[in-house]
């Protein structure tokens, strides 16, 4: 043999109970002591420090703290130094050293020592990770190193968590003993934060010890708080709230069209939109994610706004008889009432649509003119004017005539036409044609689609001449002999050389 000792590096005991510190030692065989003595020291191995003597085999003299509380269970002659401490109290917690005394110069304090921990709560061991939906084993362990008092274990607050299985007394690696009870159950998210307790009691004593552990159940997020669809007026302030329940707290992300707008590790996340515009109308998604899973929900934001100024597309110039199609469109929320007017007369209207198609089959000159497209909802009204130009061959109106006044003859040729025609006055009896370009004789005035050309003739009285008015544009020509009204005296002018 050689000098050496074996004892648990640490050992525990409940306050008020006892503890047996198992201990073996060895020494060289050739020392052959007649009697083996030993000393247990508290907290220091150096005799020079005068550490408290826990037990001494040579004498009954021990430190007052250990008076009547220490006894050697082992037989030193058999190299067993097992120590029993009774009625342990917190001040007895610390290091215990054994010193073998073989006589002569052979006294040896073993560096191996035992640290006694005085406890007053059972140790509830919960796995480092408890996940909802996955079976877990929770154990309650208490020291069982007192041969005189054996603990009995019971669970507290385990209702609905399964029936406990008592494993009984187990030997630990270093020779210490524990009493173990197991609880197997499948935790739910609701079990998070649940206080689970274990009670150690000692029969025939009033000693009772309780310990508790709060369950830290990990579970994936569930979004529990979310706006229903939101309507907001353009320019107003909008708050979108997303709240999730999870453990650990989730990473909450507000997204729109794949773009992250805001994110944070939190139980709830507010997305603030200042002065919303129609561009922010759409579907917003909240994503909640932790290591155990994810959840997502969406909310629609509807930004309410007055119609935009309508845009008008289509043919603005048409030939008489053609079909004209004009599209008036706008953007608003809600969709507007769209109306097309002409001279205060409603031509077409739609309710809650963003576009209005106006169809004019076989347009006539009467369709020519200014039109209005008006868009209106509860937030406002906007209008756009547009002109439709209907093109047609000249029409000589009935008010065309000639009239004499003293020494002058005036001929009016009134033409309705689009585009504007060229007008010529023909005097067949004189084989003369006067064009509108001859400003000395012809004066033209246009009002809308009506062109009035006036030919003024000066001269001596005579029988009235025949005057033919001809109007011409790209769609055709029309001629009319102008009727004469009033006196039959002709005042004529010589035209030309």
């Amino acid at each position: 043999g050689h000098w050496g000792a074996w004892m648990p590096s640490s050992i525990s005991a409940f306050e008020g109970t006892c503890v047996s510190i198992p201990c073996r030692f060895d020494f060289p065989d050739e020392l052959r002591p007649a009697v083996v003595h030993g000393v247990w020291y508290f907290n220091s191995p150096y005799p020079k420090n005068y550490p408290p003597v826990v037990f001494k085999s040579r004498t009954q003299v021990v430190h007052e703290s250990f008076q009547g509380r220490s006894r050697l269970l082992g037989d030193l002659g058999l190299r067993n130094c097992t120590l029993l401490l009774s009625n342990v109290s917190p001040e007895l917690g610390g290091k215990y050293y054994f010193r073998g005394d073989l006589g002569g110069y052979n006294q040896y304090t073993f560096s191996e020592h035992s640290v006694l921990d005085i406890v007053n709560t059972p140790n509830i061991v919960v796995p480092p990770e408890v996940v909802a939906g996955t079976e877990v084993e929770v154990s309650c362990m208490v020291p069982d190193n007192c041969p005189e008092l054996r603990p009995e274990l019971s669970w507290l607050g385990h209702e609905g968590l399964g029936e406990p299985a008592v494993l009984g007394r187990l030997r630990e690696d270093e020779g210490t003993w524990v009493q173990v009870s197991l609880l197997h159950f499948v935790p739910t998210r609701e079990a998070n934060g649940h206080r689970l307790g274990c009670q150690a009691s000692f029969p025939n004593t009033t000693l009772q010890f309780e310990g508790y552990a709060s369950m830290d159940v990990k579970y994936p997020p569930v979004i529990v708080e979310m706006n229903s669809s939101v309507e907001a007026i353009e320019g107003s302030h909008v708050s979108l709230l997303c709240g999730a329940d999870s453990n650990p707290p989730p990473l909450l992300t507000w997204m729109r069209d794949g773009t992250v707008l805001r994110e944070a590790v939190a139980e709830s996340l507010l997305l603030e939109l200042e002065e919303v515009t129609p561009a922010e109308d759409g579907v917003y998604a909240c994503l909640a994610e932790n290591a155990y899973g994810q959840d997502n929900r969406t909310v629609g934001l509807s930004v309410m706004y007055a119609p935009w100024k309508p845009t008008v597309n289509g043919t603005m110039v048409a030939v008489e008889g053609e079909t004209v199609s004009i599209l008036c469109s706008t953007q608003s929320n809600p969709d507007p009432i769209l109306t097309i007017f002409k001279e205060k007369q409603i031509l077409s209207t739609v309710i809650y649509e963003s576009e209005l198609q106006l169809e004019l089959p076989a347009v006539s000159p009467e369709d020519d003119g200014e039109y209005w497209c008006v868009a209106e909802n509860q937030y406002g009204q906007r209008a756009t004017a547009f002109n439709l130009s209907v093109e047609f061959a000249p029409v000589l109106l009935l008010e065309s005539h000639c009239a004499a006044a003293r020494d002058t003859v005036q001929c009016l040729c009134v033409v309705k036409s689009n585009p504007e025609p060229s007008v010529a006055f023909e005097l067949p009896s004189r084989n003369v044609t006067v064009n509108e370009s001859e400003r000395e004789f012809v004066y033209s005035e246009r009002s809308g689609l009506v062109l009035t050309s006036i030919l003024t003739l000066r001269g001596q009285a005579q029988a009235p001449p025949r005057v033919i008015c001809t109007a011409r544009n790209l769609y055709g020509a029309k001629s009319l002999e102008l009727p004469f009204q009033g006196a039959h005296r002709l005042m004529w002018a010589k035209i030309g050389p």
Partner: antibody
Framework: QVQLVQSGSELKKPGASVKVSCKAS????????MNWVRQAPGQGLEWMGW????????TYADDFTGRFVFSLDTSVSTAYLQISSLKAEDTAVYFC???????????????????WGQGTLVTVSS | DIVMTQSPDSLAVSLGERATINCKSS????????????LAWYQQKPGQPPKLLIY???TRESGVPDRFSGSGSGTDFTLTIINLQAEDVAVYYC????????FGQGTKLEIK
């Protein structure tokens, strides 16, 4: 040079006490253990035990427990042997003897007694 | 305890001759950890304290004449004095200091 000087002879009555001193010089007192050896008239040597002068811890041989006490006064490099309840059979010459000690942390190794005091005769007689 | 037995109890040797004293221990005094024999020899003259002659069974203490030598191992040991001188008359003790310290009963050496 190393010297161990013991106190003089003592004549004591049975039941009395005696205290024998051993003053050391010429070396570091706490580096050596101090032993006590008894020699009854015309008899051999009997080891009574020793005291660790560094720690103050005494060790008694099995036949010398109870009435025998080893003590120290390191300030004057002196060891003491006190015998109480003296008996006639305690009549003997008492020697102190030093022994080297080699320390290893909390433990040590003791060696042979190399220097002896001159001896103190204690006579117990009524 | 380890019992030390010396032989003879006494012997007479002529001056200049060799004296041999034996010592037997009841158990080995050889320490396995350092392979040393924890045995010493002392000389005690009348009215004087013992004087150390030999330790570790064979190592001579300083100042001791080389006429004195020790030998042996385990349980059997011998003290040899050659060229015996008149001042060598004394009682010789063997002593083990491995376990609880013990002495032999002593051997008385005289001049023949």
């Amino acid at each position: 040079q190393v010297q161990l000087v013991q106190s003089g002879s003592e004549l004591k009555k049975p039941g009395a006490s005696v205290k024998v001193s051993c003053k050391a010089s010429g070396y570091t007192f706490t580096n050596y253990g101090m032993n006590w050896v008894r020699q009854a008239p015309g008899q051999g040597l009997e080891w009574m035990g020793w005291i660790n002068t560094y720690t103050g811890e005494p060790t008694y041989a099995d036949d010398f427990t109870g009435r025998f006490v080893f003590s120290l006064d390191t300030s004057v490099s002196t060891a003491y042997l006190q015998i109480s309840s003296l008996k006639a059979e305690d009549t003997a010459v008492y020697f102190c003897a030093r022994n080297p000690i080699n320390y290893y942390g909390i433990n040590y190794e003791g060696y042979v007694m190399d220097y002896w005091g001159q001896g103190t005769l204690v006579t117990v007689s009524s | 305890d380890i019992v030390m037995t010396q032989s003879p109890d006494s012997l007479a040797v002529s001056l200049g001759e060799r004296a041999t004293i034996n010592c037997k221990s009841s158990h080995s005094v050889l320490y396995s950890s350092n392979q040393k024999n924890y045995l010493a020899w002392y000389q005690q003259k009348p009215g004087q304290p013992p004087k150390l002659l030999i330790y570790w069974a064979s190592t001579r203490e300083s100042g001791v004449p080389d006429r004195f030598s020790g030998s042996g191992s385990g349980t059997d040991f011998t003290l040899t004095i050659i060229n015996l001188q008149a001042e060598d008359v004394a009682v010789y003790y063997c002593h083990q200091y491995l376990s609880s310290l013990t002495f032999g009963q002593g051997t008385k050496l005289e001049i023949k």
